[in-house]
């Protein structure tokens, strides 16, 4: 029957007892950075092209004995995972190993910087189709792999990489860390976060997505014939450079910033237990294991959103925390958290030609990250529009006036410590939905886009009671762009989304009286393109 | 149920060409090896290759590679052996049998072509 | 290429009685990664294909009735009948399938004394 990894990453359409998925990834080449492999196993023979290259340290101490099985026991079981014949994801996909892991699985920086060199130069000397290079391997932070990973991507080829297998925050290794590259945490077969003896997969901000990696059963060096079970992240990026190179198949001309977003859009939602995380960083970490979509076309009406959060700022008074978009993507709105809720809120601004999400600590706070809601709009023309505080009773009132233009997200920033809390909330006027409204001591700040036929609607879910946390969604054909919290709300931590949902939280209920300014709103921006949906149908 | 049907008996004589055939049916077809083993009269067995339907790769005992071809059409989940110039040697019994990357070992047999080559 | 080496040729054995068949490989058909012998036995009677009586050394296939026993690791392995029947008369054969080419035993004729 089919292993169980495979059936995870299949939509319930194609389920059946053989994994035989509609488009075997034909038309990309997978290179694969990792240890030597046994190329003339069943299981990934004819597939797998040895290049020459090899840059490796020497193996630790004296008694080590170099045996062929398990010098290339990691690499042949990933390039089994991606590609192979019986239990690979995507089954057509070619590949080429380069090897820079040592017969004990141990590389250097140097050796990955010399083989992604190799690569580009590849590349150029003889283009081929969609390139995804896969980077099962993680090490300390290093900026200068990070540097390098970025400089590929830019070149138009997916890097897929593992998070790492320390149980610790993945922005602390590279290349899981560098923005540019996919990076893959693991789960089991119940869902839940791989464990690896005292250790396990990594997490935190700088996780794209998570994907099976425990059990997996792929092509043993021990012989021909061979299959055997191997766990970690490398495993699990091995599934999405699977689900890369299918996707690449069919749509070749998505850009890596559209094969994110519907990695991201296409993956199980919310069935990760958090619980295993640390709870500094269980908001952090994104609560998706990947999957096929459910149909290799047809995904281009949507508009593709994701969530992208900020280093932490630190907890002095002046820091701040920025969350940027990648570059084909718009940043439709900006929100910011802090822990103990203290914060001066955020901002949309201008940082070397592109909008940034910067979030502002407060006096006494112990830092705020910042949350950029970055989108897929193509032919967008955004613009920021502030109201400086306004001093006035109503508070402060800023909307989209340029013809064309709509509301897709609304952030406030404030200079003072304190915004006088026991102020009663600023109610919306109704019928005035394209404005964002606050507080009358902050300024607040208007994402106004035109994209030809975007549409936006606000929608609020108020509770009178205070609560840890209020929630509003869009529903189905809707994407959310904007999440914010009603002004007036003293305790508010912050507002951020989470896939499709505006998410509102509150201190701690029982540290808050249930007296009127308890009240909690979470605002959502709800756009849709009517634009793609009929590009799309021209399409087809 | 699953079985492997081989196509009947062949007498040629030296020099023409053949090609014999093995049907899967009762389960997927292209999800599982077919290879074929000989066995010449009063002989043992004798594996010659194999190959995957799924994307038809290939692979010879060294001892008949260039001797015989082996091809599939999946569409009618059909493996072929064929042989562009037979000998008197060729003379044997060709059994097809199918194997699984997770059941290696040969669990269905076809019942087996007779090919006689003889002038 | 793994060389397959039964013994004995041939084994005349009484009905009801024990049949010991033997079987060594030039190396080991045994691997760490899942501890399993890549080996397997057939049973081929006069006119018909080859069955798959044991795989994994030990494993009987379903089907086969429990008199058919297979034992060993690493290179030397044994498939037992522990009580003759009339309908065992056959030709029996050890096969390893962990590399290319795949090899089987001379076989081993098994006949009624």
């Known amino acids: 029957s089919i292993p169980w990894n495979l059936e995870r990453i299949t939509p319930p359409r194609y389920r059946a007892d053989e994994y035989q998925p509609p488009d075997g990834g034909s038309l990309v080449e997978v290179y694969l950075l990792d240890t030597s492999i046994q190329s003339d196993h069943r299981e990934i023979e004819g597939r797998v092209m040895v290049t020459d290259f090899e840059n490796v340290p020497e193996e630790d101490g004296t008694r080590f004995h170099r045996q062929a099985s398990k010098c290339d026991s990691h690499g042949t079981h990933l390039a089994g995972v991606v590609s192979g014949r019986d239990a690979g994801v995507a089954k057509g996909a070619s590949m080429r190993s380069l090897r820079v892991l040592n017969c004990q699985g141990k590389g250097t920086v140097s050796g990955t910087l010399i083989g992604l060199e190799f690569i580009r130069k590849s590349q150029l000397v003889q283009p081929v189709g969609p390139l995804v290079v896969l980077l099962p391997l993680a090490g300390g932070y290093s900026r200068v792999l990070n540097a390098a990973c970025q400089r590929l991507a830019r070149a138009g080829v997916v890097l897929v990489t593992a998070a790492g297998n320390f149980r610790d925050d993945a922005c602390l290794y590279s290349p899981a860390s560098a923005p540019e590259v996919i990076t893959v945490g693991a789960t089991n077969a119940q869902d839940q976060p791989v464990t690896l003896g005292t250790l396990g997969t990594n997490f935190g901000r700088c996780v794209d997505l998570f994907a099976p990696g425990e059990d997996i059963i792929g092509a043993s060096s021990d012989c021909s014939t061979c299959f055997v079970s191997q766990s970690g992240t490398s495993q699990a990026a091995a599934h999405v450079a699977g689900i890369a190179a299918m996707m690449l198949s069919a749509e070749p001309e998505l850009t890596l910033a559209e094969l994110r977003q519907r990695l991201i859009h296409f993956s199980a939602k919310d069935v990760i237990n958090e619980a295993w995380f640390p709870e500094d960083q269980r908001v952090l970490t994104p609560n998706l294991v990947a999957a096929l979509p459910p149909s290799t076309h047809g995904a281009g009406w949507q508009l593709f959103c994701r969530t992208v959060w900020s280093a932490h700022s630190g907890p002095t008074r002046m820091a701040t925390a920025v969350a940027r978009c990648a570059p084909d993507e718009e940043l439709l709105s900006c929100s910011s958290f802090s822990r103990s809720g203290k914060r001066r809120g955020e901002r949309m601004e201008a940082q070397g030609g592109k909008l940034v999400c910067r979030a502002h600590n407060a006096f006494g706070g112990e830092g705020v990250y910042a949350i950029a809601r970055c989108c897929l709009l193509p032919q967008a023309n955004c613009s920021v529009h502030t109201a400086p505080p306004a001093e006035a009773s109503m508070g402060t009132r800023v909307h989209c006036h340029q013809q064309g233009h709509v509301l897709t997200g609304c952030s406030s920033h404030w200079e003072v410590e304190d915004l006088g809390t026991h102020k009663p909330p600023v109610l919306r006027p109704r019928g005035q939905p394209n404005q964002c409204v606050g507080h009358r001591e902050a300024s607040i700040h208007a994402s106004c886009c035109h994209a030809p036929g975007l549409e936006c609607k606000v929608k609020e879910h108020g509770i009178p009671a205070p609560q840890e946390q209020v929630t509003v969604a869009c529903e189905e054909g809707w994407t959310l762009t904007g999440c914010s919290a009603l002004p007036g709300t003293s305790h508010v931590l912050g507002a951020y989304a989470v896939d499709n949902t505006c998410v509102v939280r509150s201190r701690d209920v029982s540290t808050t009286g249930s007296t009127s300014e308890g009240a909690v709103t979470a605002v959502a921006i709800c756009c849709r393109s009517r634009h793609l949906a009929q590009a799309s149908q021209e399409l087809q | 149920q699953v079985q492997l049907v081989q196509s009947g008996a062949e007498v040629k004589k030296p020099g023409e060409s053949l090609k014999i055939s093995c049907k899967g049916s009762g389960y997927s077809f292209t999800n599982y090896y077919i290879s074929w083993v000989r066995q010449m009269p009063g002989k043992g067995l004798e594996w010659m290759g194999m190959?995957?339907?799924?994307?038809?790769?290939?692979s010879y005992n060294p001892k008949f590679q260039g001797q015989v071809t082996i091809s599939a059409d999946k569409s009618i989940s059909t493996a072929y052996l064929q042989w562009s110039s037979l000998k008197a040697s060729d003379t044997a019994m060709y059994y097809c049998?199918?194997?699984?990357?997770?059941?290696?070992?040969?669990?269905?047999w076809g019942q087996g072509t007779l090919v006689t080559v003889s002038s | 290429d793994i060389v397959m080496t039964q013994s004995p040729d041939s084994l005349a054995v009484s009905l009801g009685e024990r049949a010991t068949i033997n079987c060594r490989s030039s190396?080991?058909?045994?691997?760490?990664?899942?501890?399993?012998?890549?080996l397997a036995w057939y049973q081929q009677k006069p006119g018909q294909p080859p069955k798959l009586l044991i795989y994994w050394a030990s494993t009987r296939e379903s089907g086969v009735p429990d008199r058919f026993s297979g034992s060993g690791s690493g290179t030397d392995f044994t498939l037992t009948i522990s009580s003759l029947q009339a309908e065992d008369v056959a030709v029996y054969y050890c096969?390893?399938?962990?590399?290319?080419?795949?090899?089987f035993g001379q076989g081993t004729k098994v006949e009624i004394k």
């Open positions: 190959i995957y339907p799924g994307d038809s790769y290939t």
């Open positions: 190396q080991s058909v045994l691997y760490s990664s899942n501890n399993k012998n890549y």
């Open positions: 096969q390893q399938y962990s590399s290319f080419p795949i090899t």
């Open positions: 049998a199918r194997d699984h990357w997770s059941k290696p070992y040969f669990d269905i």
